[in-house]
Interface confidence: low
Amino acid sequence: GSHHHHHHGSDYKDDDDKGSQDDEFFHELPETFPSDPPEPLPHFLIEPEEAYIVKNKPVNLYCKASPATQIYFKCNSEWVHQKDHVVDERVDETSGLIVREVSIEISRQQVEELFGPEDYWCQCVAWSSAGTTKSRKAYVRIAYLRKTFEQEPLGKEVSLEQEVLLQCRPPEGIPVAEVEWLKNEDIIDPAEDRNFYITIDHNLIIKQARLSDTANYTCVAKNIVAKRKSTTATVIVYVNGGWSTWTEWSVCNSRCGRGYQKRTRTCTNPAPLNGGAFCEGQSVQKIACTTLCPVDGRWTSWSKWSTCGTECTHWRRRECTAPAPKNGGKDCDGLVLQSKNCTDGLCMQAAPDSDDVALYGS
């Protein structure tokens, strides 16, 4: 806000004002202030604002006060010469009060020539019949941005969903550099992508690394003078491989006797990515197995023919037991029983079309 200092008579200098040799200037200030009609203290409509000198470009400081019979700048407690002021005055139609505005130009040389611990500053002083009012101090500084970052981000290899911190301390500068982060040349907006967070001290945090966060990250520092880029930090989000489930055991690879069964798994759940570790352990497991050999059945030799029966036939038989089929071996081909006609003893074969009954003897 404005600092109000009431002055009467010719006491227009503050305690911190240094006397000026510039008598010509001070003769311009009123010796006394008329007391009638009563007037309010000057009020600043616009106060001078801090300014930065970029390269060799001078800056303008500006202020406006009402009511004001006089308005001048002083810089570093010294009055600025009247001829260095650009002054304009008008009457405010609403209030009928005089509005005065003034501007001065400050060069780089003026700022550089100031010795002492304090920065170059200027303030406006406005007079009315009621006294004087001083504006706030407006500091004028030479703007710069050093080339070297105080800390640059460091590349990292991180596993999926891990938190990542990329540090950045921008180069020293006036005004203090603003920092933004680039991901592959695109500006990171944490409001748009909530997985990114930029800390108050300019570090970038990736809350949970995603595969899409594999990228080149650059810290960018900028102020009114320049824009500087840090070295690029490569973040690689890797995925360690994981095994799939085992397949079912295969059938024994030997049809007969000793062999093995196997089952397999693959490093695809997930597959390793971006240099992630390959799965540790076996991709194939084998176990011994024994398959019983198949035995094909074979016939025994035929039995003796039976005695001739009542039907005038006799028969003989054989068994599929020499050996019997086992473990999926083939069964015997052919007949178990064989029969044929016979006429032994009292058996008489009837003629094909005869109605004779056969006679049997004992």
Epitope: Q162, Q167, V235, I236
Partner: antibody
Framework: QVQLQESGPGLVKPSETLSLTCTVS????????WSWIRQPPGKGLEWIGY???????NYNPSLKSRVTISVDTSKNQFSLKLSSVTAADTAVYYC?????????????WGQGTLVTVSS | DIQMTQSPSSLSASVGDRVTITCRAS??????LNWYQQKPGKAPKLLIY???SLQSGVPSRFSGSGSGTDFTLTISSLQPEDFATYYC?????????FGGGTKVEIK
């Protein structure tokens, strides 16, 4: 098998510049982060800085104003220069390889060379 | 800078003992922690990287654990060749920093 070998003068006068070279054999200097680390007699380890074959460097802020690390890929070498040395810079200087992007760790080290700063 | 604090600074143990060394970071470093062994007159040797991964060729009696700020190196059964100084090192951010070391001596 990767091997690193430091070389350079063992005695440097105060205010002069310490210069050391690390020769990498059994592997390429391409990729990896090549660091210098020092250890004052009877004390702990201090990282000085690293260089990548691309030329990217990163220095310990406590030494930054005095340190330069450079790389010569054609000779498979990287070098350290430390200016304006004092007795406090007396140490065994190691070169080491940082594996991975920069997550390091230092998986191969030189055997170290003692540099004494004395007039 | 991230400070790494090791404890104890030294310890005495016998062959066959189980030995535990701790390392604390001044801020969270996720799993970016490595352990080294150094014998007098020799360069450090990598034992464990990324907090718990055993470096190739290192005996399985060495193991590492921890995440965030607190980490542990354990030697399950101390062998004569294990008497040395052990250092932790963070690689979460530059400057890369080491712990002050833990000297393991014969009791």
């Amino acid at each position: 098998q990767v091997q690193l070998q430091e070389s350079g003068p063992g005695l440097v006068k105060p205010s002069e510049t310490l210069s050391l070279t690390c020769t990498v054999s059994g592997g390429s200097i391409s990729s990896y982060f090549w660091s210098w680390i020092r250890q004052p007699p009877g004390k702990g380890l201090e990282w000085i800085g690293y260089i990548h074959n691309s030329g990217t460097t990163n220095y310990n802020p406590s030494l930054k104003s005095r340190v330069t690390i450079s790389v010569d890929t054609s000779k498979n070498q990287f070098s350290l220069k430390l200016s304006s040395v004092t007795a406090a810079d007396t140490a065994v200087y190691y070169c080491a390889r940082g594996r991975g992007m920069a997550t390091l760790p230092f998986d191969y080290w030189g055997q170290g060379t003692l540099v004494t700063v004395s007039s | 800078d991230i400070q790494m604090t090791q404890s104890p600074s030294s310890l005495s143990a016998s062959v066959g003992d189980r030995v535990t060394i701790t390392c604390r970071a001044s801020q969270s470093i996720s799993s970016y922690l490595n352990w080294y062994q150094q014998k007098p007159g020799k360069a450090p040797k990598l034992l464990i990287y990324a907090a718990s991964s055993l470096q190739s060729g290192v005996p399985s009696r060495f193991s590492g654990s921890g995440s965030g700020t607190d980490f542990t190196l354990t030697i399950s059964s101390l062998q004569p060749e294990d008497f040395a100084t052990y250092y932790c090192q963070q690689s979460y951010s530059t400057p890369l920093t080491f712990g002050g070391g833990t000297k393991v001596e014969i009791k």
